[in-house]
């Protein structure tokens, strides 16, 4: 992790890096490694991609162990093949308003993420994509075998969608905070980011937090009850310690994780909060990192890898984060 020891490189020559990822010398000048990309965790040995103007942001001078690859101030963003200047806002699609900040893109949904519970007036609510409409809208399917005339038999009317208003005015500053992005890893420790100007100087800044949607080693499908297709929030039997690049959380946590489905849906965090976690490293150094903690998960068909990148990143995501 640090450069105090002798150089030890893997036996095979140089690693094969994915397209667009630079092959660079590690921070110790020892071995050739695939450079870490924007938003990934970095260390002294695992440097960020210098050809993309990235540097390892350790967050505070006290913490020199693990950082996040960050673009230098003013770095542009490449998004969907278009280059945007830092500070520039754009609409990635009719559903998302995005902002570029120092190489990172943060987006806010323009469509309502509202839910609808069944009622006599709308016994089988569904969100559907309608031709010519950007946002999904609620329709109320009627019961097939109903003969009684009443609220449950009403002809459905589609929703006039009101997007959530994520802004507020404060002392001549229009405060805007994007949603937390989806966790960069579907299992294990990853990074989630957002862009905000909710600070004393009203300047846009990037914030990041560690996140773990589920542990990689958990075989969650085994726990799905007979006749069910999903396990939304599996019970974690024992408290765990988080691990981060060789460092271990000081406290144990009875954390919640998201489950899995067997019918093609994916389960993602829905309501989360952000709390500081202290990690202790083998050399005794202690560092504090903000981390996402899951309150509730949602299982849905808008899975990462679907056509709309932000649909998969933000659908029912990070609802009502407290931090």
């Amino acid at each position: 992790q640090n450069c105090s020891g002798p150089c030890r490189c893997p036996a095979e020559q140089a690693p094969r890096c994915p397209a667009g990822v630079s092959l660079v010398l590690d921070g110790c000048g020892c071995c050739r490694v695939c450079a870490k990309q924007l938003g990934e965790l970095c260390t002294e040995r695992d440097p960020c991609d210098p050809h993309k103007g990235l540097f390892c942001d350790f967050g505070s001078p006290a913490n020199r162990k693990i950082g996040v690859c960050t673009a230098k101030d003013g770095a542009p963003c490449i998004f969907g093949g278009t280059v945007y200047r830092s500070g520039e806002s754009f609409q990635s699609s009719c559903k998302y308003q995005c902002t570029c900040l120092d190489g990172a893109v943060g987006c806010m949904p323009l469509c309502s993420m509202d839910v609808r519970l069944p009622s006599p007036d709308c016994p089988f609510p569904r969100r559907v994509k309608l031709p010519g409409k950007c946002c999904e809208e609620w329709v109320c399917d009627e019961p097939k075998d109903q003969t009684v005339v009443g609220p449950a038999l009403a002809a459905y009317r589609l929703e006039d969608t009101f997007g959530p208003d994520p802004t507020m005015i404060r002392a001549n500053c229009l405060v805007q905070t994007t949603e937390w992005s989806a966790c960069s890893k579907t299992c294990g420790m990853g990074i989630s980011t957002r862009v905000t100007n909710d600070n004393a100087s009203c300047r846009l800044e990037k914030q990041s937090r560690l996140c773990m949607v589920r542990p990689c080693e958990a075989d969650l499908e085994e726990n799905i009850k007979k006749g069910k297709k999903c396990i939304r929030t599996p019970k974690i039997s024992k408290p765990i310690k988080f691990e981060l690049s060789g460092c271990t959380s000081v406290k144990t946590y009875r954390a919640k994780f998201c489950g899995v489905c067997t019918d093609g849906r994916c389960c993602t965090p829905h309501r989360t909060t952000t709390l500081p976690v202290e990690f202790k490293c083998p050399d005794g150094e202690v560092m504090k990192k903000n981390m996402m903690f899951i309150k509730t998960c949602a299982c849905h068909y808008n899975c990462p890898g679907d056509n709309d990148i932000f649909e998969s990143l933000y659908y029912r995501k990070m609802y009502g984060d407290m931090a």
């Epitope: 309502s112 509202d114 839910v115 609808r116 519970l117 069944p118 009622s119 006599p120 007036d121 709308c122 016994p123 609510p125 609620w138 109320c140 009684v148 009443g150 609220p151 009403a154 002809a155 009317r157 589609l158 929703e159 006039d160 969608t161 009101f162 959530p164 208003d165």
Partner: antibody, heavy 114, light 110 residues
């Protein structure tokens, strides 16, 4: 963000008509129904009635002869009118969204007194 | 007049399991009653937890589950937390109107 806000006079004279308005934001009242509920001091909840998304209404039989719920979709507002009030109508009045009564207003206190 | 009855009060220890029930005076509760469960914590607004018998609102933790048990609507809390201390009301639909239960005051010990 879904919000419901009740408003109206806090004091109504006996035999007069109590008029309250529920102003809604974050959803459309042409998509969701809105319920009126009241709570007497230290007591449980009493359902008054509902206006459904299509404009139909249903009322608690106890209020049937003197209650009217209507809506103005252009303003996203629902109103409650309760006529011939007595001291027994003194309560906190709430509006709530249909669908699990998921979102509620903070409530408005109405006192019936001369 | 239809009456909906709930336990006036229940007490549970943290980590324990408790079931709140909602009985109809005119027979068994069914899915056609669209049983709803509403929570009010001290000093806070009401909010719906469960709608349509068993559907959780997005903010409702997984430890809350709605079901039909022995002809009654039931709200089960597993692994009760101190913050679950609140007043819980059920509401049942009867073709043309809703009726609320009297409410259950849930106390979480210690």
């Amino acid at each position: 963000e879904v919000q419901l806000q009740e408003s109206g006079p806090g004091l109504v004279k006996p035999s007069q008509t109590l008029s309250l308005t529920c102003t809604v934001s974050g959803f459309s009242i042409s998509t969701f129904g809105v319920h009126w509920i009241r709570q007497h001091p230290g007591k449980g909840l009493e359902w008054i009635g509902v206006i459904w998304r299509r404009g139909g209404t249903d009322y608690n039989a106890a209020f049937m002869s003197r209650v009217t719920i209507s809506k103005d979709t252009s303003k996203n507002q629902v109103s409650l009118k309760l006529s011939s009030v007595t001291a027994a109508d003194t309560a906190v009045y709430y509006c709530a969204r249909d669908g699990g009564f998921d979102y509620w207003g903070q409530g408005t206190t109405v006192t019936v007194s001369s | 007049e239809t009456v909906v009855t709930q336990e006036p009060s229940l007490t549970v220890s943290p980590g324990g399991t408790v079931t709140l029930t909602c009985r109809s005076s005119i027979g068994a509760v069914t899915t056609s009653n669209y049983a709803n469960w509403v929570q009010q914590k001290p000093g806070q607004a009401f909010r719906g937890l469960i709608g349509g018998t068993s559907n959780r609102a997005p903010w409702t933790p997984a430890r809350f589950s709605g079901s039909l048990l022995g002809g009654k609507a039931a709200l089960t809390l597993s692994g009760v937390q101190p913050e679950d201390e609140a007043e819980y009301y059920c509401a049942l639909w009867y073709s043309t109107h809703y009726v609320f239960g009297g409410g259950t005051k849930l106390t979480v010990l210690g």
